[in-house]
Interface confidence: low
């Protein structure tokens, strides 16, 4: 007879990332006796919920339960039944819900209330659903990538993402791009963080970190596109918008009511003499880039230096991990390689945007047209945001590393969020035997 393996002494945690365009469920696992070690938590599953982000359910909240079912059932299968009751479940909603809350606190609360009631029906230890702040989103993303890169550990890290080792313990900055917001978070070099709203202090594993973070609401790739369209339709002489950010030959009808639905386009709202307009792609990277730059107000800065819209940004320092849509878009465009210079990226974007829509559809037959049509804009937007928004240069471009996963775990805010809420990042460096810690992030 075979020997039965001893049951693993492991723990699990679930985090749902309720983003503006979709919801993803992540399952994390770690050895129970090593909770306070750095780098022991890893992702065992990602389940993408079918459908849009939860903010889109505002008029059909009764459908939220069904919407979450598949991924919650998947969690039930992956996590051993004996562990269900002690597995914490957290849902964090990001910029899509921040925008809904700006429009109506009541509607946002109604959505979260139904989400909470739906998640409470499962046998896990549900810990609540909340809209996290942009500052939290930035901070937890920074914690995630540095935890996975072993930056908080005194031991050598498992995994090197750069071909050279400068200072092993120097943290990476985090660049996160979502559908509705984008975050930049890093430790500046001996620089005062002039704006208190952008300053975070952490003590992690016995070391102090002074971290700069900012979340630009309305500057995620989807909301940036809505902003650009709302801005450009103001000068259109009729209901045809010749748009350089879409491929030549591409056509799409847009409802004006959809354009002005989001708070992000309020600043460009005007009474138009038509209810619909047609985007006609002309595929010109340079013109697209110029149009995008008009979304960034760089004329006003009350600090020693700014990103855009009067927001303080210290001089960039060190290496940066660029993840979420930064990674997905650049991966699709085949531009994530460390060897591709900024000049080369720009060159390739020029060629890509100029390709006729019919040709693009043929080349990428398996990709949904809605997503396929927006890669020219998204790629151009990423370049504009990084270069003109955050002031990366051709030289500092090589310090940006487009990251999807690190050691099998997705780069993003969810892991850092769970580590914090489960008290798994101690303020002091743990001794060789696990101790109980009272001070956490």
């Amino acid at each position: 007879t075979q020997n039965k393996a001893l049951p693993e002494n492991v723990k699990y945690g679930i985090v749902l990332d309720a983003g503006s365009s979709h919801t993803s469920l992540y399952i994390y696992k770690w050895p129970a006796e090593k909770e306070n070690d750095t780098g022991v938590v890893h992702q065992v599953e990602e389940c993408r919920v079918k459908g849009p982000g939860i903010s889109k359910f505002v008029q059909k909240v009764n459908e939220i339960g069904i919407y979450l079912t598949d991924c919650m059932e998947r969690a039930r299968e992956v996590i051993p039944r004996s562990q269900h009751q002690e597995t914490p479940v957290y849902l964090g909603a990001t910029a899509g819900m921040r925008l809904l809350r700006m429009e109506s606190e009541e509607l946002a609360d109604r959505v979260l209330d139904v989400v909470e009631r739906s998640l409470s029906n499962y046998p896990f230890d549900f810990q609540g659903a909340r809209i996290i702040t942009g500052q939290e989103e930035g901070a937890y993303g920074w914690i995630t990538i540095n935890y996975l890169l072993g930056k908080f550990s005194q031991k050598t890290r498992w995994f090197s993402i750069v071909p050279y080792e400068t200072n092993n313990q120097e943290t990476f900055g985090a660049l996160d791009l979502g559908g509705a917001s984008t975050q930049v978070t890093f430790v500046p070099q001996n620089q005062t963080i002039e704006s208190p709203d952008n300053a975070l202090q952490f003590r992690l594993y016995g070391k102090d970190y002074n971290v700069y973070t900012h979340s630009f609401l309305c500057y995620g790739k989807d909301q940036a596109l809505w902003q650009k369209l709302a801005k450009d339709i103001q000068v259109a002489s009729n209901e045809i918008l010749r748009d350089p950010c879409f491929h030549p030959g591409y056509k799409k009808v847009v409802n004006v009511s959809d354009l002005y639905k989001t708070p992000c386009t309020k600043r460009f709202e005007m009474t138009l003499p038509f209810q619909q307009f047609e985007i006609q792609g002309i595929g010109n990277y340079q013109q697209c880039h110029q149009s995008i730059l008009e979304l960034f107000n760089t004329s006003y800065c009350p600090y020693s230096q700014c990103a855009f819209n009067g927001i303080f940004l210290p001089p960039l320092q060190g290496d940066f991990g660029a993840f979420s849509a930064f990674y997905f878009v650049m991966k699709f465009l085949n531009l994530t390689s460390e060897k591709v210079s900024q000049e080369k990226v720009t060159e390739m974007m020029k060629k890509f945007c100029a390709q006729p829509w019919e040709e693009i559809k043929t080349s990428y037959a398996g990709v949904k047209e809605k997503y396929l049509s927006e890669y020219c804009f998204s790629g151009t937007y990423i370049l504009s945001l990084l270069l003109q928004g955050y002031h990366f240069t051709a030289d500092s471009w090589e310090h940006i590393h487009f990251i999807g996963k690190i050691q099998g775990s997705d780069a993003g805010w969810t892991l850092g969020y769970m580590l914090n809420l489960t008290n798994m990042i101690p303020a002091e460096q743990p001794l060789s035997t696990p101790l109980s810690h009272s001070t956490y992030v």
Partner: antibody, heavy 120, light 113 residues
Framework: QVQLVQSGAEVKKPGSSVKVSCKAS????????ISWVRQAPGQGLEWMGG??????NYAQKFQGRVTITADESTSTAYMELSSLRSEDTAVYYC???????????????WGQGTTVTVSS | GIVMTQSPDSLAVSLGERATINCKSS????????????LAWYQQKPGQPPKLLIY???TRASGVPDRFSGSGSGTDFTLTISSLQAEDVAVYYC?????????FGGGTKVEIK
């Protein structure tokens, strides 16, 4: 129709602070950019700062002395001015609207004004 | 910041006559992406808050009589009252909302001759 109602007149000593409130009704407050403008006796209008999309901007002249905040739960914006001096005696107005990045149409709705007198 | 200069400081016009106020900005307030001038005109009567008359340099605000009109582009702007009425006695201000800090002209006092 949006209306802005401001708090009442204040008499303050030099060196103290004043906090003026501006309550909005009849509109979605969270998407209202709010500017604060003051007018000294017999003088013109002077923009102090504004708040929109949660971000405050201040005129250089008032930087460090003025704080503009908004409480969405009560649809109220606040302007606090510290280290008051006699030349801060003025009528303080809140108004909906502002700059290119906070309101497209100038300042189209104004509060009734709050008189602040700074005197020892 | 952008300096707004208004002229004249005061103006006395007979009832039913035309009143013209000028406003000059130290730099252009024309936003190229939408070809709009970020300039507004306000009217302020004694003891009252200012009232928006014109935005985007030439668009009348809701409820403003059509005797008020705005014109100009870039750096030079004009507010015209085509036929002055008694109720138009007030101080008029121009204001740019193109760049922070927002700035107002010094004001023009309009009286009846």
């Amino acid at each position: 129709q949006v209306q802005l109602v401001q708090s009442g007149a204040e008499v303050k000593k030099p060196g103290s602070s004043v906090k003026v409130s501006c309550k909005a009704s009849g509109g979605t407050f969270s998407s209202l950019p709010i500017s604060w403008v003051r007018q000294a006796p017999g003088q013109g209008l002077e923009w102090m700062g504004g708040i929109g999309f949660g971000t405050a901007n201040y005129a250089q002249k008032f930087q460090g002395r003025v704080t503009i905040t908004a409480d969405e739960s009560t649809s109220t914006a606040y302007m606090e001015l510290s280290s008051l001096r006699s030349e801060d005696t003025a009528v303080y107005y809140c108004a909906r609207g502002g700059a290119k990045y906070a309101g497209r149409y100038g300042m189209d709705v104004w509060g009734q004004g709050t008189t602040v007198t700074v005197s020892s | 910041g952008i300096v707004m200069t208004q002229s004249p400081d005061s103006l006395a016009v007979s009832l039913g006559e035309r009143a013209t106020i000028n406003c000059k900005s130290s730099q252009s307030v024309l936003f190229s992406s939408n070809n709009k001038n970020y300039l507004a005109w306000y009217q302020q009567k004694p003891g009252q808050p200012p009232k928006l008359l014109i935005y985007w340099a030439s668009t009348r605000a809701s409820g403003v009589p059509d005797r008020f009109s705005g014109s100009g582009s870039g750096t030079d702007f004009t507010l015209t009252i085509s036929s002055l009425q008694a109720e138009d006695v007030a101080v008029y201000y121009c204001q740019q909302y193109y760049l922070y800090p927002l700035t107002f002209g010094g004001g023009t006092k309009v009286e009846i001759k």
